[in-house]
Interface confidence: low
């Protein structure tokens, strides 16, 4: 004898938005107000996050997905869906454990958040420094002197350094 | 599931030593700053030590010279070596993770008790 | 040492009070902002409610909130709940050379 039919579960063809009611004999009940379920065959709907103080709502909650948030202006998101706010600091400056604080010399930052990073070593390339590097900006390479002959190419700025961000995760 | 686990609380001799474990999950470690966080029974909470992402470390007066936070990488778990132990050390001993600032401790461990008496 | 004092170490309030529990530090916090505030229920482990003295964590009701700057912050719940019974502790971050501080802790109770 071959089983042909599997034992299913009562509540899977409950689809998203709605959740499998117990009191209502598994009947596909829909979420109530402020929750949803963003799968098929819940028990129950999720809350709705609700992005008060600082966090302000990027999409509105529907029965289907939760709301998603972001930051106020002055602050920066951290942790997968933004479960954090952080605060930015000023270009030039780093985020440390105890705050804002400016890049040390021969480091810098050019965002609001993230970290300072060196300047461009243009010596590495055979180049020399055409405009040195701030807190704020790195350094721009020039031709090295072997390049100052007739025809020589322009000026070469450094390539862009990749934003390293924050990675809470 | 992003969460914290300790282990290694017992009991322990005046002048002994003991190593906690605090496993993490669902994060890693090293993009992380942790701190041991500890409560004496019926006490309030009392800041030990913080291992930042880059590895520094800092400690409390109390713990400053007896205890090293460390961490492995590879098996994703912070350590707190206690050395010197005394009995007012006996506590629940939190591993908890924070975000930016030191005082953003968001995540933490269920705690596990050490108990120093002779 | 730097002192962190909490006041009061424990208040009896009805439900809907508005409840008021303040961290005095004899040293300026970093940034005069690096103070959070926490929730520790019986046998439960902390909760971080406030960071940045005055930013709601996230999933916290906003019957909670923080103020205060420098030496001086303030926890204030607008209108206390059957579920806010607990105690609050407040943690305060300085410079590299002196300890992180948790206050003492104040002990809320339904009258």
């Known amino acids: 004898f071959e089983r042909t039919r599997s034992l299913q579960d009562p509540c899977s063809n409950c689809p998203a938005g709605t959740f499998c009611d117990n009191n209502r004999n598994q009947i596909c009940s829909p979420c109530p107000p402020n929750s949803f379920s963003s799968a098929g065959g819940q028990r129950t709907c999720d809350i709705c996050r609700q992005c008060k103080g600082v966090f302000r709502t990027r999409k509105e909650c529907s029965s289907t997905s939760n709301a998603e948030c972001d930051c106020t202006p002055g602050f920066h998101c951290l942790g997968a869906g933004c479960s954090m706010c952080e605060q930015d600091c000023k270009q030039g400056q780093e985020l440390t454990k105890k705050g804002c604080k400016d890049c040390c010399f021969g480091t810098f930052n050019d965002q609001k958040r993230g970290i300072c990073r060196p300047w461009t070593n243009c010596s590495l390339d055979g180049k020399s420094v055409l405009v040195n590097g701030t807190k704020e900006r790195d350094v721009v390479c020039g031709p090295s002197p072997a390049d100052l002959s007739p025809g020589a190419s322009s000026v070469t700025p450094p390539a862009p350094a990749r934003e390293p961000g924050h990675s809470p995760q | 599931e992003v969460q914290l686990v300790e282990s290694g609380g017992g009991l322990v001799q005046p002048g002994g030593s003991l190593r906690l474990s605090c496993a993490a999950s669902g994060f890693s470690l090293n993009n992380n700053a942790i701190s041991w966080v500890r409560q004496a029974p019926g006490k309030g909470l009392e800041w030990v030590a913080i291992?930042?992402?880059?590895?520094?470390?800092d400690y409390a007066r109390s713990a400053k010279g007896r205890f090293t936070i460390s961490r492995d990488n590879s098996k994703n778990t912070l350590y707190l070596q206690m050395n010197s132990l005394r009995a007012e050390d006996t506590a629940v001993y939190y591993c908890?993770?924070?975000?930016?600032?030191?005082?953003?401790?968001?995540?933490w461990g269920q705690g596990t008790l050490v108990t120093v008496s002779s | 040492d730097i002192q962190m004092t909490q006041s009061p170490s424990s208040l009896s309030a009805s439900v809907g009070d508005r409840v008021t529990i303040t961290c005095q530090s004899s040293q300026s916090v970093y940034n005069n902002n690096a103070l959070a505030w926490y929730q520790q229920k019986p046998g439960k482990v902390p909760k971080l409610l406030i960071y940045l003295a005055s930013t709601l964590a996230s999933g916290v009701p906003s019957r909670f909130s923080g103020s205060g700057s420098g030496t001086d912050f303030t926890l204030t719940i607008s209108s206390l709940q059957p579920e806010d019974v607990a105690t609050y502790y407040c943690?305060?971050?300085?410079?590299?050379?002196?300890?992180?501080?948790f206050g003492g802790g104040t002990k809320v109770e339904i009258k």
């Open positions: 291992i930042q992402n880059t590895g520094t470390t």
């Open positions: 908890a993770r924070g975000y930016g600032f030191e005082s953003e401790l968001v995540i």
């Open positions: 943690l305060g971050v300085y410079n590299d050379d002196v300890d992180n501080g």
